[in-house]
């Protein structure tokens, strides 16, 4: 005789709204096995019987949370399986606050889960990330559950909530951090992240003073024409393969400024350009370091800025000038962010 | 000179009330999240409770949640601790610390004041 | 909720001798962590904050070392003035907890 379960898991995690069918068999040298599914609730799913066989459908709801129990008999022979059913809801609905941090101040930021089954601490977690690293520094306060107000009954989804104080973000601030909430379950882990922008000053890099009226760029990393007017670089994750940096600046509206192009595919070569009319000229004024170490190529409203020997940008501020007029945009490029290999 | 002097203790029937007071002096109130930490007699130290500089977040120990609260006024550079429903447990040398900004440690500590509660 | 475990829960030491003290979490805190002295009758004094770092108008005969889980305090050369009762306390998360107390005595 053989008996099976497919699959063959002992314990299964569905994702609500989702199906999944448990078929049990059983082969019997003398005649027809008996196969049936036992322990069941009412309400855990439906069965289809055959000679044979056995297959349990769940329906992905949270009632079908449960742990049936496949047994097969052939003869005087029986065996038995129980397969332990979680059904989790895990949507990606995560909600920051506040929507961007402001460098130089204490501020509590939140990240909340929202729609979320199990509402359990142990299998949901939490984490404050810059760049792919948890933020050092950063202090949990103590977490929230409520129940989600729900429009049918019987579905118990809660959000759940973690707020940090944050560190300083030193000087100059990352560009964005990142809520991290992972849930962990029976042979899977699922993950969902959102970015929280961090305001950056346009015109020095230093951290802003709050009270200063100085005009603010709001970096994000989603995707979009690689054009900057200010800190626009993202940190990259710490394993290859790099995506390519194509981040988008929103910033307020003010004197009409040089944008920083980076490319790079041509061993992190940035580009300063200008685009305000003729007579206009555009230089590195900034960079990390002794700007004297760079490799520098002046054109008028272009002006090139690369590392010799070819290699990685270094950490820090890099600030292009406008003249006449004098306005600068400065780039922040953080540390080990590593430029793809040209093939 | 940064100080923190408490008062308000006293000896208190079991179910009784009690609040406490902080005075803080020689830094800017407002700026600094503030902690009560308590020490039962010849046991060690226990967080009871903080509250963030503009009184927005507060939190508390499971011993007292729900029958402490810790509340500020800022104009007064005070904080305080209403403590209701009190215990013989909460019998204690009552503290109250500075947390400092960007590190979370506790740097400056006051004297302590003491609430026995006892019929 | 993070539990912090001193030891050892008592020492007794001489005036020169060097002191070590540790200090467990049951989970990482990374290097959020302080130590605090407290005298008999008096309110625990701030001596080291981040693991590692000494609080201004500390003796430098005090030193922390540690991160994540496992910490020490050593007093390089004890001195009469630094017997007393040692507390660890992590703050990486809350609700912020304390070792159970480490007593220096005179031998």
């Known amino acids: 005789q053989s008996f099976q379960v497919n699959p063959p898991e002992s314990e299964v995690a569905v994702a609500m709204g989702t199906s999944l069918q448990i078929t049990c068999s059983m082969s019997c040298d003398e005649g027809v096995a008996r196969v049936h599914w036992r322990g069941l609730d009412t309400s855990l799913g439906s069965v289809q019987t055959l000679p044979g066989s056995s297959i349990l459908s769940v329906r992905g709801m949270l009632s079908d949370t449960g742990t049936p129990v496949c047994v097969g008999s052939c003869g005087s022979r029986s065996f038995q399986h129980s397969v332990k059913i979680l059904v989790y809801a895990f949507p990606d609905q995560l909600v920051v606050s506040p929507e961007f941090l402001v460098p130089g101040q204490d501020q509590v930021v939140s990240c909340t889960a929202h729609n979320i089954w199990p509402a359990d601490p142990n299998s949901l977690s939490f984490a404050l990330l810059l760049g792919e690293q948890r933020l050092e520094g950063a202090q949990a306060l103590e977490p929230e559950q409520e129940e989600e107000i729900q429009e049918a009954e019987g579905t118990p989804l809660f959000r759940m909530t973690q707020r940090w104080r944050l560190p300083s973000l030193g000087t100059p601030a990352p560009p964005a951090l990142h809520c991290q909430v992972t849930m962990q379950l029976p042979k899977l882990v699922l993950t969902h992240r959102k970015e929280i922008p961090v305001l950056q000053s346009q015109t020095s890099p230093k951290p802003p003073n709050t009270t200063s009226a100085e005009p603010y760029i709001l970096t994000s990393s989603s995707t979009a024409e690689a054009v900057s007017t200010g800190l626009n670089i993202t940190t990259l994750p710490s394993a290859p393969p790099y995506p390519k940096l194509s981040p988008r600046t929103l910033s307020s509206e003010g004197p009409c400024r040089p944008k920083i192009h980076q490319d790079l595919e041509a061993g992190w070569e940035l580009l300063c350009e200008a685009s305000c009319g003729p007579g206009v000229t555009v230089r590195w004024t900034l960079a990390p370091g002794d700007l004297a170490t760079y490799h520098k190529r002046e054109a008028g409203a272009q002006a090139w800025l690369s590392v010799l020997p070819p290699g990685p940008m270094v950490e820090g501020w890099f600030q292009c000038r406008q003249d006449p007029g004098g306005e600068v945009t400065n780039l922040y490029v953080p540390g080990q962010v590593t430029p793809n290999s040209s093939s | 000179e940064v100080q923190l002097l408490e008062s308000g203790g006293g000896l208190v029937q079991p179910g009784g009330s009690l609040r406490l007071s902080c005075a803080a002096s020689g830094f800017t109130f407002s700026d600094f999240w503030m902690h009560w930490v308590r020490q039962a007699p010849g046991k060690g130290l226990e967080w009871v409770s903080y509250?963030?500089?503009?009184?927005?977040?507060?939190n508390y120990a499971d011993s007292v949640k729900g029958r402490f609260t810790i509340s500020r006024d800022n104009s007064k550079n005070t904080l305080y601790l209403q403590m209701n429903s009190l215990r013989a447990e909460d019998t204690a040398v009552y503290y109250c610390?500075?947390?400092?900004?960007?590190?979370?440690?506790?740097?400056?500590w006051g004297k302590g004041t003491t609430v026995t509660v006892s019929s | 909720d993070i539990q912090m475990t001193q030891s050892p829960s008592s020492l007794s030491a001489s005036v020169g001798d060097r002191v070590t003290i540790t200090c467990r979490a049951s989970q990482s805190v990374s290097r959020s962590l302080a130590w605090y002295q407290q005298k008999p009758g008096k309110a625990p004094k701030l001596l080291i904050y981040a693991a590692s770092s000494l609080q201004s108008g500390v003796p430098s005969r005090f030193s922390g070392s540690g991160s994540g889980t496992d910490f020490t305090l050593t007093i390089s050369s004890l001195q009469p003035e630094d017997f007393a009762t040692y507390y660890c306390q992590q703050y990486k998360s809350y609700p912020v907890t304390f070792g159970q107390g480490t007593k220096v005595e005179i031998k």
């Open positions: 509250i963030s500089g503009d009184s927005g977040y507060t």
């Open positions: 610390a500075r947390d400092r900004p960007y590190y979370y440690y506790m740097d400056v």
